[in-house]
């Protein structure tokens, strides 16, 4: 199943020759260009960058590129009124108070319209009271608070680090704690490399910077007011109370310099172990409150930032299939960012701009793909996926019909050590096949496949001598494709030695200092890296597009079905009275996984087999393969999450960022000991298990000889 | 089945011991926190003491009126939890239910009574 | 401490009849409450717990309300078996505490 074949042109139009028209050079000049200003979404700035991509890739070939506009939830600072956070004494005096902006980097002094740092969608307010530091915020640190320590946070200010989970979980879990207030800060320990200098000298993150984010839990819903469909021209829109996700307590974050002022006071409990504990010089008592000498001292927030309905723009070009247009690869990645966006999404977005410009050469000459390609410059990732999410609901007919596979393209780099990939398992085997034809840009791998220093760098956990390849969670605009839709999907970039660097993400990630210069002069300065992504994510696109036969592995489904089976069981079987009180039992999805396995296997072996010279053959076996991550839809969606509807993946319901197998049961047993009635609480485990076998085995039967 | 089963009270002396037990079933004791409270006709229902599971490394929680005076503990192996009173006072004369985390099933109790 | 205060302390139903008892905590306790039922000589059963979710095996008769400080029990049709005693407690933090208790008697 090769797809060296071309259509209509000369053989010379294959793989080959799209990889060998993708230059490094390029891909450093279009992130140069889109990282000289602010691209903050819903702004003039941004509508003027979508109007240049869509001109660019006119030119570069495709057959159309449309403007596509949304008018959805925004958050924004008050300019007149900024948010800062102070500590207040007995008299109500603020005798500190947190900065208002990031010292701006060299050469970006006199740069208009940079945001100061803010957490999007955060409702106003003045909350006063004692602090109590929570850790990272996840739910096994407030379980540690309450649990075991004994400590309240209702009514009370909590100041977590950043970091290990989605921002916007850590203000839930706040929330659900009973806070009023949420302060948020990078510590060193997680974004300040050891050995490595600060901004502009290094990589790092100085005291004075601070990571935006917004702080939603959508859970795959979209624009905030419009849950389920487009926020189109005629949309009905909620009210503000009834929007989807907001956070209900105000929230701020701040860097290192002003988290130690507010950490060095901390009184109360000690830290109950080593793992609350950061690098900057202060005990991290969790408190509540100030120690003895300061213990009349308050926090007080002031949050003044607004929701605004705004109109964004995706971009949407499309390159025609000559044999099948009705069927869509889709590569896609975000245009807007919280400043300059020199990583996040530029790093993406100049990638995705030189396989546009490698393809539509290749049109120029005469060559089509089989299938017609979709590239998307989405707006509004960083406000929670709004653009790509409110494109597909105004799509999703044609989605679900017509879509073979969406590959994401956020920041290409998060790092420069190895490859990192997270895909459904239907692409593993193309991932494989493509990584070992490219060669790698490793240091000491020169003259050495992708597929050998990735698999060294990064091996599989299970199976040896072949490498690491992760379940898809969320946080990017995959998530409307594979949660909601059931479109297999995939996303690569070159990432960090995870072994060695344990700080989470990189430590100028969403600051002001995240420009062109971070990337050229410390991440990768020859754009190799930048280049061998290009490489990944367009060859994908490119396989996908163009192979006769689509280059999907049903058998790969079976194994990790039978892994995450195996774990979901295991995690089960920490209550085995209760399994017998209840008669829980999992053997209807091990035998749906082995009716799988046994179903894959003879679908494969067709595969080899039939004549693909007939095209109705083919495009039956193929639509079997499209259809099959859609079979793992479920239409009512998960419990309390209709949006995330794959029964196999779905985000963690404790951090967005990571996936979750078998979510359903995962979830129902989740914490079941401390569920107040286990009659119920059993009884939703059974009811997941249940639907979990059932979409297996229906899934099975989607790949069963049709007649 | 949810089952709790109080055992060895009595009568005791001012001033005296006793170690109450209770042995748990239908449920798999060692992840679960327990419980024991107290009941008067004069105070009515009154929370005594907790202890978590291993997983909460075995944290235990007392109210005042025992503090220093009792000790829960558990034997997860005999799926048992267990409650050793000392000094005991005329005013913890009570029936002693075992109960499951947030009261959700309690045993049929044990009665001690503190009398000269 | 946390100080639940129940009323009335007793109070006479017919069969048929609805009934309503409410439980008072000294401060916020969320939903953090139970409702439990005692017959004479046995232990308390569960009947309500988060204030408002009804345990299982529990008669769609009692329904529970309330979050903050004021909560209530209800019993939209009092039946024969039902007279006897009903306490609400919070587990919202440490004492873990309990009202004085409702006797409710039949008419």
């Known amino acids: 199943k090769s797809s060296n074949e071309a259509t209509n042109i000369t053989p010379k139009h294959n793989m080959k020759a799209f990889l060998d028209e993708l230059k490094a050079e390029n891909i450093k000049k279009f992130l140069y260009n889109f990282t000289q200003i602010p691209h903050l979404a819903g702004t003039e700035q941004n509508f003027q960058l979508a109007k240049q991509i869509q001109s660019q890739w006119k030119e570069f070939g495709l057959d159309s590129v449309e403007l596509a506009h949304y008018d959805v939830l925004l958050s924004y600072p008050n300019k007149t009124h900024p948010n800062y956070i102070s500590i207040i004494n007995e008299d109500g005096n603020e005798i500190f108070n947190t900065s208002l902006f990031e010292p701006p980097p060299p050469g970006y002094e006199n740069v208009s319209d940079i945001v100061p740092p803010f957490s999007a969608f955060s409702p106003q307010g003045m909350p006063e009271g004692d602090l109590v530091y929570v850790n990272y915020a996840r739910t096994e640190d407030f379980f540690k608070l309450e649990r075991d320590m004994k400590i309240n946070c209702s009514g009370k200010i909590v100041i977590a680090r950043y970091g290990k989970v989605f921002r916007g979980n850590k203000v839930k879990n706040a929330q659900l704690a009973g806070a009023k207030g949420v302060i948020l800060y990078s510590d060193p320990a997680d974004y300040f490399a050891p050995g490595v200098k600060s901004y502009p000298d290094g990589w790092n993150l100085p005291g004075g910077g601070v990571q935006r984010g917004n702080i939603l839990n959508l859970n795959g819903a979209g624009d905030p007011l419009t849950p389920g469909y487009p926020a189109n021209e005629y949309a009905y829109r909620r009210g503000i109370a009834e929007a989807v996700g907001l956070p209900s307590i105000p929230v701020h974050p701040i860097g290192y310099y002003d988290a130690q002022k507010l950490l060095e006071k901390m009184g109360g409990s000690a830290p109950p172990d080593s793992s609350w504990r950061g690098s900057l010089k202060v005990p991290y008592n969790v408190g509540p409150g100030f120690t003895g000498n300061f213990s009349t001292q308050k926090v007080k927030m002031h949050i003044h930032s607004t929701n605004e309905v705004t109109r964004i723009y995706n971009v949407i070009g499309t390159l025609r299939g000559a044999v099948e247009p009705d069927r869509y690869v889709i590569l896609g990645g975000h245009r807007d960012s919280w400043v300059f966006g020199g990583i996040d999404p530029q790093s993406g977005a100049a990638v995705v701009h030189e396989i546009v410009r490698s393809f539509g050469t290749l049109k120029k000459e005469g060559w089509r793909p089989r299938r017609t390609i979709l590239f998307a410059s989405w707006d509004a990732e960083e406000f929670g996926l709004l653009g790509s999410t409110e494109w597909a609901e105004e799509n999703s007919r044609l989605l679900q019909e017509r879509g073979v596979a969406y590959i994401n393209a956020d920041s290409s780099i998060e790092g420069n050590y190895t490859l990192r990939v997270d895909c459904t398992p239907l692409m593993y085997s193309l991932v494989h096949n493509l990584t070992k034809e490219l060669k790698s840009p490793d240091e000491g791998f020169e003259g050495k496949s992708l597929y050998e220093s990735w698999t060294k760098k990064s091996p599989s956990p299970e199976f040896s001598g072949m490498p690491r390849i992760s379940k898809l969670g969320s946080g990017n605009d995959f998530e409307v494709f594979f949660q909601r839709l059931g479109i297999a999907s995939g996303r690569a970039r070159y990432t960090k030695n995870w072994e060695t660097n344990k700080f989470s993400g990189y430590p100028l990630y969403h600051s002001v200092y995240e420009t062109y210069e971070l990337v050229e002069k410390f991440y990768d300065p020859m754009f190799k890296y930048h280049l061998t992504v290009a490489q990944v994510r367009g060859g994908m696109v490119f396989e996908l597009a163009n192979s006769i036969v689509l280059p999907f592995d049903c058998r790969d489904y079976a194994v990790v079905l039978r892994k995450y089976a195996d774990k979901i069981y295991s995690i089960s079987m920490k209550h085995p009275q209760e399994m017998k009180t209840y008669s829980v039992s999992f053997d209807s999805l091990f035998s749906a996984v082995k009716n799988f396995t046994e179903i894959a296997s003879k679908f494969s072996e067709r595969l080899q087999d039939f004549d693909k010279s007939n095209p109705i053959v083919l495009r039956m076996m193929n639509d079997q393969l499209m259809f099959l991550e859609r079979a793992f839809i479920d239409p009512l969606g998960l419990p309390d999450r209709p949006f995330y509807r794959h029964v196999i993946y779905a985000p963690s319901s404790h951090n967005k960022y990571a996936g979750e197998s078998f979510p359903g049961i995962y979830d129902a047993l989740f914490d079941i000991e401390s569920k107040v009635d286990p009659s119920k609480a059993w009884g939703e485990v059974k009811r997941q298990i249940y639907v979990a076998a059932f979409t297996v085995q229906a899934a099975a039967e989607t790949l069963s000889e049709v007649a | 089945e949810v089952k709790l089963e109080e055992s060895g009270g009595g009568l005791v002396q001012p001033g005296g011991s006793m170690k109450i037990s209770c042995v748990a079933s239908g449920f798999t004791f060692s992840n679960y926190w327990m419980n024991w409270v107290r009941q008067t006709p004069e105070k009515g229902l009154e929370w005594v003491a907790e202890?978590?599971?291993?997983?909460?490394?075995?944290?235990?929680h007392y109210a005042e009126s025992v503090k220093g005076r009792v000790i829960i503990s558990r034997d997860d192996s005999k799926s048992s939890v267990y409650l050793q009173m000392n000094s005991l006072r005329a005013e913890d004369t009570a029936v002693y239910y075992c109960t499951r985390r947030w009261n959700n099933f309690w045993g049929q109790g044990t009665t001690v009574t503190v009398s000269s | 401490n946390i100080v639940m205060t129940q009323s009335p302390k007793s109070m006479s139903a017919s069969a048929g009849e609805r009934m309503t008892l409410t439980c008072k905590a000294s401060e916020n306790v969320g939903t953090y409450v139970s409702w439990y039922q005692q017959k004479p000589t046995q232990s308390p059963k569960m009947l309500i717990y988060g204030a408002s979710n009804r345990f299982t095996g529990v008669p769609d008769r009692f329904s529970g309300s309330g979050s903050g400080t004021d909560f209530i029990l209800t019993a939209s049709s009092v039946q024969a078996e039902d007279p006897v005693d009903y306490y609400c407690?919070?587990?919202?933090?440490?004492?873990?505490?309990f009202g004085g208790g409702t006797k409710l008697e039949m008419k």
């Open positions: 407690g919070q587990s919202y933090t440490f004492p873990y505490t």
């Open positions: 202890i978590r599971s291993q997983s909460n490394n075995f944290a235990t």
